[in-house]
């Protein structure tokens, strides 16, 4: 066990926030400004992410962790770790190569991002349209037409109230 430990890489003793400096007998040197090492035993530090332009800093870089970016107002994050910022559109629109465009008739988008999706087809479930769809909202499906035919009401009428003091005849 002692032999194994003596053969251990001396760099493994260098904590996060430092790098193992091969030029100086493998001493642990602190990461330079604007760089970090998130794990121990690293031989170099990593350059901090710069949140510039449409990106803004959500979390500053430290010697042990990278900066985290999000997007300026009017944009939203895409990709792992907010690798891209995409322009917001209004509800009822979708982003195309030519900018924000209104949803076509029969489609909707209830968010500031994403694409316009078709209204729900109520008839596929044997239901009727209760509330019409708009560019911003999906249709609301109601009960099926059969449920609305005369004598087929699903609502049970209340039992007639008895007058106090009268017994059934």
């Amino acid at each position: 066990f002692e032999r194994t430990r003596s053969l251990q890489d001396p760099c493994s003793n260098c904590p996060a926030g430092t790098f193992c400096d091969n030029n100086r007998n493998q001493i642990c040197s602190p990461c330079p400004p604007n760089s970090f090492s998130s794990a121990g035993g690293q031989r170099t530090c990593d350059i901090c992410r710069q949140c510039k332009g449409v990106f803004r800093t959500r979390k500053e870089c430290s010697s042990t962790s990278n900066a985290e970016c999000d997007c300026t107002p009017g944009f939203h994050c895409l990709g792992a770790g907010c690798s891209m910022c995409e322009q917001d559109c209004k509800q009822g629109q979708e982003l195309t190569k030519k900018g924000c465009k209104d949803c076509c008739f029969g489609t909707f988008n209830d968010q500031k991002r994403g694409i316009c999706r078709p209204w729900t087809n109520c008839s596929l479930d044997g239901k009727s349209v209760l509330v019409n769809g708009t560019k911003e909202r999906d249709v609301v499906c109601g009960p099926s037409p059969a449920d609305l035919s005369p004598g087929a009401s699903s609502v049970t009428p209340p039992a007639p109230a008895r007058e106090p003091g009268h017994s059934p005849q």
Epitope: D21, N23, S29, C31, P32, R43, T44, C45, D46, I47
Partner: nanobody, 122 residues
Framework: EVQLLESGGGLVQPGGSLRLSCAAS????????VGWVRQAPGKGLEWVSA????????YYAESVKGRFTISRDNAKNTLYLQMSSLRAEDTAVYYC???????????????RGQGTQVTVSS
Amino acid sequence: EVQLLESGGGLVQPGGSLRLSCAASGFTVSAEDVGWVRQAPGKGLEWVSAILDSGGSTYYAESVKGRFTISRDNAKNTLYLQMSSLRAEDTAVYYCARVVYHAGGGVTYDYRGQGTQVTVSS
């Protein structure tokens, strides 16, 4: 060959001032990220200050902000550290350092000088 020669250290009373100089050769201080690290007795290295992004931004350790100022003279290829309101805890060997960016994306630095001793004591 990269060479860094520090000077300007000495013994100073608390509250006093010193100006450290670093004469560089083998590279151009105006085109590189350069700065100062220090090592206090019995302690590890600590970054004190740096000029980054070819002069676009400066870095100061929290412990020296408002007291130390980093600058450079491109014509003399020299880096400076103006230290004022010195405290006992600033006692250390100060080294001039050059940040090194590796092809794989890693960052290290080298400091080849002997350093200059700064002692703050009454």
